[in-house]
Amino acid sequence: NKILVKQSPMLVAYDNAVNLSCKYSYNLFSREFRASLHKGLDSAVEVCVVYGNYSQQLQVYSKTGFNCDGKLGNESVTFYLQNLYVNQTDIYFCKIEVMYPPPYLDNEKSNGTIIHVKGKHLCPSPLFPGPSKP
């Protein structure tokens, strides 16, 4: 048995931040689980991890330098990514693993979400007027 995951096909990260919601066909509230977000077609970069255990507080971390936070819903985990760079525009995949109680469960690979990072439009500062000649 595999858990099904739904993600938005595409998100635009304005102001270099985005909320990516991973919706599961599974209730996580009474489980010990590891939800993670992976970057790239080959899911090579683990962007963020949300570790949950029904009796303890959620642990959220990134070992790859991403600024991330996570929120748990009944059948979802939302990743909040900040300080994204334009060159981090890519496809991102949600992954879920139920560690306990057994048996171990994970998800069918989802279609992923393309996150398009739009750079901040910095307004050019007006030219500083030079000293006026008398």
């Epitope: 509230f29 009474s30 489980r31 029904y54 057994p102 048996p103 469960l105």
Partner: antibody
């Protein structure tokens, strides 16, 4: 179809031990947790613990630690519960039941027929 | 450990009536609750899982409701075959405690 076949009734002396069995069929034995439940005459159901044959994981109700020991034999798809130091308080019907995972919500949809244990001198 | 308080302990009703059995917990169990029926000399039978989901094959006169710490099993238009013992059980961690049971008798 899923079936849990439990061993027959036992009459045992105080202080003795007994081993009850629960033979599973109709599904992959190593993929499901088996729970054990006690029912004393005139009283309610009492949860003893569970055993997961896939990894030999066990959880006990603290009340039954030292009283019940859960094991399994994968080759015969059987889970065992040994009860030691028996007293009249252990006289009861003992059930095994399979835990199913309904998309993250647990329940016990399949039960054995129960084994009656009578402790008497 | 989670405490399960089931009430009433017993009730005597007539065929055709409606009954409600309640189960209270001392902390939020997020709907991780099942209801069982047990008849004398038989194994328990699962009626409802996840607090509100009726098991396939169980008559629709049985229904479950509730959330948080309070849950109910309702049986409408009671039939003679509905008499017996009813138990709730939580699955919010271990021990997976049962309620004390409700004995449903014919008046």
């Amino acid at each position: 179809q899923v079936k849990l076949q439990q061993s027959g009734a036992e009459l045992v002396k105080p202080g003795a031990s007994v081993r009850l069995s629960c033979k599973a069929s109709g599904y992959t034995f190593t993929e499901y947790i088996i729970h054990w439940i006690k029912l004393r005459s005139g009283q309610g159901l009492e949860w003893i613990g569970w055993f997961y044959p896939g990894s030999n994981d066990i959880q006990y109700n603290a009340k039954f630690k030292g009283k019940a020991t859960l094991t399994a034999d994968k080759s015969s798809s059987t889970v065992y519960m040994e009860l030691t130091g028996l007293t009249s308080e252990d006289s009861a019907v003992y059930f095994c039941a399979r835990r199913d995972d309904f998309s993250g919500y647990d329940a016990l949809p399949y039960w054995g027929q129960g084994t009656m244990v009578t402790v008497s001198s | 450990d989670i405490q399960m308080t089931q009430s009433p302990a017993s009730l005597s009703v007539s065929v055709g009536e409606t009954v409600t059995i309640t189960c209270r917990t001392n902390e939020n169990i997020y709907s991780n609750l099942a209801w069982y029926q047990q008849k004398q000399g038989k194994s328990p039978q699962l009626l409802i899982y996840a607090a509100t989901h009726l098991v396939e094959g169980v008559p629709s006169r049985f229904s479950g409701s509730g959330s948080g710490t309070q849950y109910s099993l309702k049986i409408t238009s009671l039939q003679s075959e509905d008499f017996g013992n009813y138990y709730c059980q939580h699955f919010w961690g271990t021990p997976c405690t049962f309620g004390g049971g409700t004995k449903l008798e014919i008046k």
